[in-house]
């Protein structure tokens, strides 16, 4: 804070604004009858330098001239760009306890002369907008710099506006506030920008333009679409535009897409027919405008119109599969399953499925609609049955997909050979096979079907399946494949009226089981021991169990146990062993083995056979 300079004055030579690299002389003079009261000769004038209100230097050693007790001149050099404050203070040397007293101060600004403004660009937004120009000012001057924008045109048209740049604001754009009308379309206009500050001035090169060069139409507004006869693929896009617009660009895309469809429309007059839309799809539409076919600029894109195209009847065919089980002496339960259509086939919200089961010879027909993707019915075991399913939305139904209900595994000659299942990674399994050896009818297709080897509901947990063309002998299954779960996989070979299948188990990842089987009983029959067990709970199997091992040894023996390895079958829960001595107490236990290794042992049971040794 500088008080009004009561004690004296400070002056700068050559000026308080200097170019970068220049030196300046600062003189500090006391007014008459000011200074130290008793001894004027003890007056000492000092000069302090401040940058951003922080004292950075005492210029005591920079004195170049000194009238003792009256005035001092200091030379300052190497001033940095921007403003520096200098404060002159009076130090009365006989009274060292009093701080120096401020006399006066001065601000010196260091900067550069403005460069000629460049890259002038002018625009008028819309037919009723005003001309605004922007430019590149060049290097920062660090000084207050005034800019003048001048426009001249036909019929002695002149106009100018001013603004300034300093350390708080930047001036590189001005709106002239005048409107160029379309009747001046062919006329030429010239603009020039002049920059001036305390260190110099400069002018841009003249920039020439026409009405068409600078007028950018307003983006179209009030965009809407009308679907012809509620069509899902054809619609008329409509919008409002400025009167002089002759060219439009339309872009549209489904909302989840990454690439736009682009269309140019000449003399569209706010209307354009689109014919390639996808039904029941959320679209985004935008429009841009131009005033001239060859010259001029495109407007900004309009605000987006987001809308969904209407539905159309489903296309494509459903992928159907089924399961057949005999449920009493003359009835079977048919469970039909199908996969949902993908959106491009459904072309709307599927409201229901129409399901038909028909006995071909007797012409018995069962029909129903369901909203689920499965349907179950009990029908007679006799007769040749066929099923069909179609999907319906609000506009209609897809063509029905037919499938013959055959005994899927009934024909041994149609069973595929050498079926194998290999884990590819954490979530898929590669299934390969060879064609049936002696099929008496041609294989129309293969179906690879898989189910988890875990208890499940027939209707709640439908099968997963893939249709494979007859010349392919492999399938990569990944839908609903989880690690550490064993799947039963069937490869079906289907002809027109027969089916054959082969089964294999597979997993995508495996570990050794958590525990071994639990021995529930040991019984002796005809000099053989029967070991009975309960299977390992499914979550503890951790993959496909390949085999079980039954271990036994004499109770107090330290010898290695003997063992018997049996192929795992879920339907088997007992096994005979016949190499134990009578009246010797044995300890028995079981383990389970996956491709990753052997489980810890299950419970131990002691048993002492009574019968005669084998």
């Amino acid at each position: 804070n500088i008080d009004v300079c009561k004690l004296g004055t400070v002056t700068v030579q050559p000026a308080p604004v200097i170019p970068l690299g220049s030196a300046a002389n600062i003189s500090c003079s006391l007014n008459p009858k000011q200074g130290c009261s008793h001894y004027p000769s003890s007056n000492e004038l000092i000069l302090l330098k401040f940058v951003n209100d922080v004292l950075v230097e005492n210029l005591h050693g920079k004195k170049v001239h000194d009238h003792t007790g009256h005035s001092s001149t200091f030379q300052v050099t190497n001033l940095s760009l921007g403003m520096t404050l200098f404060v002159c203070k009076l130090n009365c040397s006989n009274s060292q306890k009093k701080p120096p007293v401020p006399v006066c101060g001065v601000e010196i600004s260091v900067g550069v002369a403005p460069e000629p403004p460049q890259n002038i660009s002018c625009v008028q937004e819309g037919e009723n907008g005003t001309v605004a120009c922007s430019w590149n000012s060049g290097k920062v001057t660090y000084l207050k710099t005034n800019y003048t924008l001048q426009l001249s045109g036909p019929n002695n048209l002149t106009c100018q506006k001013q603004c300034f740049s300093d350390n708080r604001q930047n001036c590189n754009r001005l709106d002239l506030g005048i409107n160029l009308s379309p009747d001046l379309a062919e006329s030429r206009f010239i603009v020039r920008v002049t920059a001036i500050n305390d260190l110099g001035n400069s002018s841009s090169l003249p920039h020439t333009f026409t009405f068409l060069d600078i007028v950018i139409p307003l983006p179209p507004w009030d965009i809407r679409i009308n679907f012809l006869n509620a069509s899902g693929s054809r619609g008329t896009l409509q919008w409002e535009d400025e009167g002089q617009v002759v060219l439009n660009q339309l872009r549209y895309q489904p909302l989840n897409s990454t690439s736009w469809n682009m269309v140019n429309a000449t003399n569209a007059k706010g209307k354009y027919d689109l014919r390639d839309l996808r039904p029941f799809t959320e679209y985004e539409f935008q429009i841009s405008s131009k005033l001239h076919l060859s010259g001029g600029s495109w407007s900004n894109w309009s605000e987006s119109l987001r809308t969904r195209t209407p539905e159309e009847e489903p296309v494509g065919i459903l992928d159907i599969w089924y399961m057949k089980q005999d449920i009493d002496y003359d009835r079977q339960q048919i469970s039909l399953f199908w996969k949902s259509l993908n959106p491009s086939e459904a072309r709307g919200k599927i409201l229901h499925y129409q399901v038909t089961l028909q006995e071909v010879t007797k012409k018995t027909t069962l029909q129903n609609t369901t909203r689920h993707t499965s349907w179950t019915r009990v029908i007679p075991r006799t007769g040749a049955w066929t099923a069909s399913v179609s999907a319906a939305n609000s506009k209609g139904a897809s063509a029905p997909t037919h499938i013959n209900i055959v005994d899927l595994c009934g024909t041994g000659l149609l069973a595929p050979h050498q079926v194998s299942a290999k884990s590819e990674n954490m979530d898929n399994i590669l299934v390969t096979w060879q064609p049936p050896k002696k099929a008496d009818s041609a294989v129309r297709e293969y179906i690879v079907e898989w189910r988890a080897l875990q208890p499940g509901s027939i209707t709640k947990f439908p099968p997963h399946w893939l249709r494979i063309p007859p010349d392919n002998m492999s399938a990569l299954i990944s839908e609903n494949i989880k690690p550490y779960i064993c799947y039963e996989i069937r490869v079906h070979a289907l002809s027109e009226s027969q089916g054959g299948c082969s089964s294999i188990r597979g997993d995508s990842k495996h570990k050794a089981p958590v525990s071994g089987p639990h021995i529930t009983a040991i019984t002796e029959k005809k000099e053989r021991l029967f070991i009975s067990w309960t299977h390992i709970p499914f979550p503890e199997q951790r993959g496909c169990i390949l085999h079980y091992r039954i271990y036994w040894k004499e109770r107090d023996s330290t010898a290695q146990p003997e063992l018997c390895e049996i192929q795992y079958r879920r339907s088997q829960n007992s096994h005979p062993i016949s190499s134990l001595q009578p009246r010797v107490t044995y300890v028995l236990w079981m383990t389970a083995v996956t491709a990753a290794g052997e489980s810890p042992q299950g419970n131990e049971r002691e048993f002492c056979p009574q019968g005669k040794a084998n």
Partner: nanobody, 119 residues
Framework: QVQLQESGGGLVQAGGSLRLFCTAS????????MYWYRQAPGKQREFVAY???????NYLDSVNGRFTISRDNAKNSVYLQMNSLKPEDTAVYYC?????????????WGQGTQVTVSS
């Protein structure tokens, strides 16, 4: 394992009604498909009705319109409401549950409850 227990059978006059009950216990987490069967003296056991997880039901032709199968998942129970009973409906009625493991169907049966319809 799954245990099924039927009740509600008895002697009823032709044209009368009975309600059979079946309660499931044990490892029932995967039992969604429930059935009623019956076996008349000297005849084979036959399917009567079933109900799926999605409450879709299906019936033997001769009982369709007279019998209604329903379920109460909270109570792990399945019911068979039998109206307009006929003498030929006389049989032991069995509750049945089916679940699938891989492609093998496991079945569980109750002990049965006797229904006698007198003329």
């Amino acid at each position: 394992q799954v245990q099924l227990q039927e009740s509600g059978g008895g002697l009823v006059q032709a044209g009368g009604s009975l309600r059979l009950f079946c309660t499931a216990s044990g490892s029932i987490f995967a039992i969604d498909d429930m059935y009623w069967y019956r076996q008349a003296p000297g005849k084979q056991r036959e399917f009567v009705a079933y109900i799926t997880a999605t409450n879709s039901a299906n019936y033997l032709d001769s009982v369709n319109g007279r019998f209604t199968i329903s379920r109460d998942n909270a109570k792990n129970s399945v019911y068979l409401q039998m109206n307009s009973l006929k003498p030929e409906d006389t049989a032991v009625y069995y509750c049945n549950a089916k679940q699938i493991v891989g492609f093998q169907i496991d079945e569980y049966w109750g002990q049965g409850t006797q229904v006698t319809v007198s003329s």
